[in-house]
Interface confidence: medium
């Protein structure tokens, strides 16, 4: 019969012959022959292959270096790589998450619009009129100015984007 020019899914062409690919988690030891099946071996510890393959070497699991602020989000298996994420208070510097940086804090006059996650930084916004933030924080939103009226007081000092209003007693006219 004519030697094949293409092979089925999960097969590969070698020496005019279709051989079975190795399943995920295994590497190729020797190609099939007319008389023998493809020989595969499981990946070793800390190694993986995540596709049907003809690789002769497994890939090393990613190392989530704790000294770069990284930690293991999910341990690798023989079929999957380790997934790294950042420690609390840090976020990844890239999609591959190879290192982490400290979450940005919002300066006084700015509040947190969106709290940082393991993959995104803090998003800050300026405190609008009627709101303030007097701290540098990665968590705190802008706070509304105190309402002096509801406390039966009057504004003695106007608020800013960094300071609350100062309330004081009303000047009562003597009878």
């Amino acid at each position: 019969p004519e030697p094949p020019t293409a092979c089925r899914e999960k097969q590969y062409l070698i020496n005019s012959q279709c051989c079975s690919l190795c399943q995920p988690g295994q590497k190729l030891v020797s190609d099939c022959t007319e008389f023998t099946e493809t020989e595969c071996l499981p990946c070793g510890e800390s190694e993986f292959l995540d596709t049907w393959n003809r690789e002769t070497h497994c890939h090393q699991h990613k190392y989530c270096d704790p000294n770069l602020g990284l930690r293991v989000q999910q341990k690798g298996t023989s079929e999957t790589d380790t997934i790294c994420t950042c420690e609390e208070g840090w976020h990844c510097t890239s999609e591959a998450c190879e290192s982490c940086v400290l979450h940005r804090s919002c300066s006084p006059g700015f509040g947190v619009k969106q709290i940082a996650t393991g993959v995104s930084d803090t998003i800050c916004e300026p405190c609008p009129v009627g709101f303030f933030s007097n701290v540098s924080s990665a968590f705190e939103k802008c706070h509304p100015w105190t309402s002096c009226e509801t406390k039966d007081l009057v504004v003695q000092q106007a608020g800013t984007n960094k300071t609350d209003v100062v309330c004081g007693p009303q000047d009562r006219l003597r009878a």
Partner: antibody, heavy 121, light 106 residues
Framework: EVQLVESGGGLVQPGGSLRLSCAAS????????MSWVRQAPGKGLEWVST????????YYADSVKGRFTISRDNSKNTLYLQMNSLRAEDTAVYYC??????????????WGQGTTVTVSS | SYELTQPPSVSVSPGQTASITCSGD??????AAWYQQKPGQSPVLVIY???RRPSGIPERFSGSNSGNTATLTISGTQAMDEADYYC?????????FGGGTKLTVL
Amino acid sequence: EVQLVESGGGLVQPGGSLRLSCAASGFTFSSYAMSWVRQAPGKGLEWVSTINAAGGGTYYADSVKGRFTISRDNSKNTLYLQMNSLRAEDTAVYYCAKEGGKYYYYAMDVWGQGTTVTVSS
Amino acid sequence: SYELTQPPSVSVSPGQTASITCSGDKLGDKYAAWYQQKPGQSPVLVIYQDSRRPSGIPERFSGSNSGNTATLTISGTQAMDEADYYCQAWASSTVVFGGGTKLTVL
């Protein structure tokens, strides 16, 4: 041969200071994070501090934060622990340990012989 | 703060299998290491990355880690294995040790 040798321990009064050193040899010191671990008499191991390979990242146990400072001099293959405001509860054998890095994930594969710190009046 | 809990002591007869446990919240999501410490000596790494043995550590030492528990197993325990054993893991940029387990070979 990979080796870590601590020095600088001794007797100090409460409130006093001490600087421990750890001389490393037999490996590329600048490529590995290093740690200090202590052991009070008759007690278990307690992690004190870790510094990353470049020296930029430092980590401390809550019990020593603000009092102890870890540092390293990669040109001298030496790790340091500056201990200030010492307390009686800091009395322990202090070990210097090498982080395993990519070879011994999340573990300390080489330890020094330890240096004894006694805080007493 | 993160805590690792070990039994204070474990006893085993020579030739038998000793198991020392270490428990912590979702410990299986972290990598556990184990150290052996004999009286007057520095700790020695016996298991890292849950189940791997450094070169020079006998095959009778093995480890596993899943769920909330890591386990150090010593099969065919010998008198020379009598020591304190400590588990260790990284958690939130800190290194955490278990309280230690004294292994007695009867």
